[in-house]
């Protein structure tokens, strides 16, 4: 009675192909003949699953990275089968938005390029989708802005699709820095004020980051010794009549308002004295 190890051992995948991430995969360990009889089976990678009793291995919720598996049929000796590739298919992984240009801060007017990156996908054929606030923006791997504006700021996501599924990036916040714009001088209580009362001029603007420094100018383009957002004239004099404008500065640059005219008229008392 000649004893010999198990012959022609093969690992057979029982599932229909393709196998998808999350599937339950059943493999059997087959052999042609053995003397003495096969008493146990081994599987590689070792210890990844509970020791299967018969020559059948069930992998619950198969991972995307389960690549190859081999079995051995053992009597007094173990004979190993060639490894089989599970070839698990999975949706794109590790999707993220990456800013290609510029490297650091984004300024209004810049040409900006965002890249939708992913680490791997099986199958490799993918589609891209960009969205902002639920609105589809593009279907390329890159999202390009020729001249970005403050209105383009917001939360962006990209999606990568393959035949198995789709994966979204984390929301990516695009912040646009811009010099003060839309500056205007507002006047309170109005642009016509009686002498002796108070007039407040406010420099209103839109800026990111906010304006850090204001400069006020009169009709002669003479800078006034005031550097806050509000210019308070109290008591206001007839000589204060004229056009005023303001300049706002932030870390990006400067902006200036158009001229606004303040008219200060004489009080009845002054008129009566004349």
């Amino acid at each position: 009675d000649v004893q010999y190890p198990p012959k022609k051992v093969t690992t057979v995948i029982q599932n229909p192909m393709p196998i998808r991430e999350g599937d339950t995969v059943t493999l059997s360990c087959n052999y042609n003949s053995s003397n003495p009889s096969v008493t146990r089976y081994e599987w590689k990678p070792h210890g990844a699953w509970e020791e299967p009793s018969l020559g059948v291995l069930k992998i619950q919720n198969v991972g995307w990275d389960n690549t190859t598996i081999a079995c051995a049929a053992c009597n007094s000796w173990c004979s190993w089968a060639s490894p089989v590739a599970l070839n698990v298919q999975y949706a794109p992984r590790d999707v993220r938005v990456r800013k290609i240009k510029p490297l650091s801060e984004i300024h209004s007017g810049n040409s900006v390029s965002l890249q939708c990156d992913f680490s791997s996908s099986h199958p490799k054929e993918v589609q891209f989708f960009w969205e902002k606030n639920g609105r589809l923006l593009g279907k390329e791997s890159q999202l390009n802005f020729d001249s970005i504006s403050p209105e383009d700021a917001g939360s962006y996501s990209c999606w990568v699709n393959n035949s198995i599924g789709q994966t979204a990036s984390k929301a990516w916040t695009l912040e646009v820095l811009y010099a003060p714009r839309r500056l205007r001088v507002s006047m309170s209580p109005g642009d016509q004020v009686m002498e002796g009362k108070s007039a407040t001029l406010t420099c209103e603007s839109d800026a990111n980051p906010p304006v850090s420094h204001y400069t006020w100018f009169d009709w002669n383009n003479q800078s006034l010794p005031y550097h806050s957002q509000k210019l308070r004239l109290e008591p206001v004099k007839v000589q204060h009549s004229g056009a005023y404008w303001c300049q706002g500065t932030n870390s990006v640059g400067k902006g200036r308002s158009p001229l606004s005219t303040l008219t200060v008229y004489y009080s009845p008392e002054t008129i009566g004295r004349r």
């Epitope: 490297l103 650091s104 801060e105 300024h107 001249s147 980051p209 640059g253």
Partner: antibody, heavy 115, light 107 residues
Amino acid sequence: AVQLQQSGVELVRPGASVKLSCTGSDFNIKEDYIHWVKQRPEQGLEWIGWIDPENGDTEYASKFQGKATITADTSSNTAYLQLSSLTSEDTAVYYCATYGSLDYWGQGTTLTVSS
Amino acid sequence: DIKMTQSPSSMYAFLGERVTITCKASQGINSFLTWFQQKPGKSPKTLIYRANRLVDGVPSRFSGSGSGQDYSLTISSLEYEDVGIYYCLQYDEFPRTFGGGTKLEIK
């Protein structure tokens, strides 16, 4: 990729003026400010000033007021730095840079002021 | 003008060592601070902006922190290619101002 190409080495006499150039490729210089930075031999970096090529607005560090004049020609996508009344103190490498917080830099122009 | 005081002006460190460089502004700069690396004969290269945001492609061993007036650049484990001069730049106000630089060399 954004690139800034600067003019070559300059050797000039004291008291003279010089105009250095910085040409953008793969981007329009109107997209952001062009900054100029000075680096004297074995020394640190000094910000000279910037220009907004879109409208010609400029801003200078007080130290360089009267010494430096920054201009731009959008038709050739080029910014310039003119330095006047040169002395040995102006011997340095001059860089142009653009975008964000100075993301992209030219290779630098070496200016030597010597008689 | 905002003055940026950088320290140390030069330092030696062992490969694998943790290295920290600091920059102190003469007034608050709202985290508008960039760190550059410059190698001999080369232009500066941006590593970190807005005090703590790593530029894409810069190794993750570089990190930045700080707020208000005090900022720092840390290299978690020094590598040979990290030798060079490091500069901080404040871009909160005009004129832009640089720190004096820190020359980093291997022991």
